[in-house]
Interface confidence: low
């Protein structure tokens, strides 16, 4: 006769492992007992369990509650056992030793492989700011057995680097994604993709990029100089900029306080019916946590009673 088993049995952490051992004997042969042992134990074989043809299943105290026979119906020549709830420490070599009558003893070995699926973690790098050089955007770490594969899925241009740390029964893989921050990356997804034989599908963790920036400021409203004349209603200046985080706006007058009646509404400066008192240099100050910008304009309100023309100067400063 001979033993039928598998070279390798592979299970995922927490699953039940069936350790196969079937004696294919000649007619009239019987299996007296089947002994299962860890064959890679440091101090000789460590018995797991023994299937006795008369006295049934005996389980080592170290495996109490974890070793069972497959559910019925059972073939008396089948010495397979179930190892419940496989853990990493179960990985290794196992030996099945079958004692038969009258043919004697047979033994076979198999290797149990326990896959430990990773639980990946994504850690964003330091705050991204426009103008920085190559900067860490995020790192992704996954630990498993065997070592997982960690890659990145993104439209963003960048560079990746990976490193691996081997532990006694697993390996941790860390991949870093570096980029040169630009405002166009704002809101773009950066996805860490972890592949592993113990996963039914890749695990994906998405991080949304936030890049701090502040655009140059400019002021709109003075495009048609002839509209800025005494008596005109609804005149307004609008400060234009954009940033991340969204900026706040502040209006001042360089050559004195804001005239009475002038309303500040965020990025907009609203004027009452214009008088020559409204002539002056107005400054829009734009700021966020990242930076600040100024833009100033000269308003010259035309008095139709006078012949003098109106001039408008625009100056931007950072």
């Amino acid at each position: 006769g001979e033993l039928e088993t598998s070279d390798v049995v592979t299970v995922v952490l927490g699953q039940d492992a069936k350790l196969p051992c079937f004696y294919r004997g000649d007619s009239g042969e019987q299996v007296g007992q089947v002994a299962w042992a860890r064959a890679d134990a440091g101090e000789g074989a460590q018995e797991l369990a023994l299937l006795h043809s008369k006295y049934g299943l005996h389980v080592s105290p170290a495996y109490e509650g974890r070793v069972e026979q497959p559910p019925p119906p059972r073939n008396p020549l089948d010495g397979s056992v179930l190892l419940r709830n496989a853990v990493q420490a179960d990985e290794g070599e196992y030996e099945c030793r079958v004692s038969t009558f009258p043919a004697g003893s047979f033994q076979a070995r198999l290797r149990l492989r326990v896959l430990v699926p990773p639980l990946p973690s994504l850690n964003p790098g330091p705050a991204l700011e426009e103008g920085q050089g190559l900067t860490l955007a995020a790192s992704c770490t996954a630990e498993g057995s065997p070592a997982p594969s960690v890659t990145w899925d993104t439209e963003v241009k960048g560079t990746t680097s990976s490193r691996s740390f081997k532990h006694s029964r697993s390996a941790a893989v860390t991949s870093e994604f570096h980029l040169v921050p630009s405002r166009s990356m704002n809101g773009q997804p950066l996805t860490c993709v972890v592949s592993h034989p113990g996963l039914l599908q890749d695990q994906r963790i998405t991080h949304i990029l936030h890049v701090s920036f502040l655009a140059e400021a400019s002021v709109r409203g003075l495009e048609d100089q002839n509209l800025w004349h005494v008596g005109r209603e609804g005149a307004m200046l609008k400060c234009l900029s954009e940033g991340q985080p969204p900026p706040s706006y502040n209006w001042t007058r360089l050559d004195g306080p804001l005239p009475s009646g002038v309303r500040v509404d965020g990025d907009t400066l609203g004027f009452p019916p214009l008088t020559t008192e409204h002539s002056g240099i107005y400054v829009c100050h734009v700021s966020n946590e990242f930076s600040s910008r100024d833009s100033q304009v000269t308003v010259d309100v035309l008095d139709p009673q006078e012949d003098s023309g109106k001039q408008v100067d625009l100056v931007s400063a950072s």
Epitope: N85, A86, V87, P118, P120, S121, I205, H207
Partner: nanobody
């Protein structure tokens, strides 16, 4: 061994909000999962939401769009922001910390915090 302490439960009117917190201490691993379950009187305990160390989330269909789970890895704390609360959200809310152990994965549970939503 892991200890969990929940807080933030209470009585709130329908449509209101509450924020639950759960602080974990003890042997916290680098690959743990944290989350919230709830148990209404006379019903089985059900999953509400879970979150990985990297911020990936999973929600029960009944709370999607209303509840938000978050965590502070540095403080080993998980939060559950509950908005647009409904009377059917009334339950004891239990924090769970899922740790690798010799037998696969082990769940550690908090004592629970009561959330009551009145109509």
């Amino acid at each position: 061994e892991v200890q969990l302490v929940e807080s933030g439960g209470g009585l709130v009117q329908a449509g209101g909000s509450l924020r639950l917190s759960c602080a974990a201490s003890g042997s916290i691993s680098s690959i743990n999962l944290m989350g919230w379950h709830r148990q209404a009187p006379g019903k089985q305990r059900e999953l509400v939401a879970t979150i990985t160390r990297g911020g990936s989330t999973n929600y029960a269909d009944s709370v999607k769009g209303r509840f938000t789970i978050s965590r502070d890895n540095g403080k080993n704390t998980v939060y559950l922001q509950m908005n647009s609360l409904k009377p059917e959200d009334t339950a004891a809310y239990y924090c769970v910390d899922v740790e690798p152990s010799g037998m696969g994965w082990r769940d550690y549970w908090g004592q629970g915090t009561q959330v009551t939503v009145s109509s």
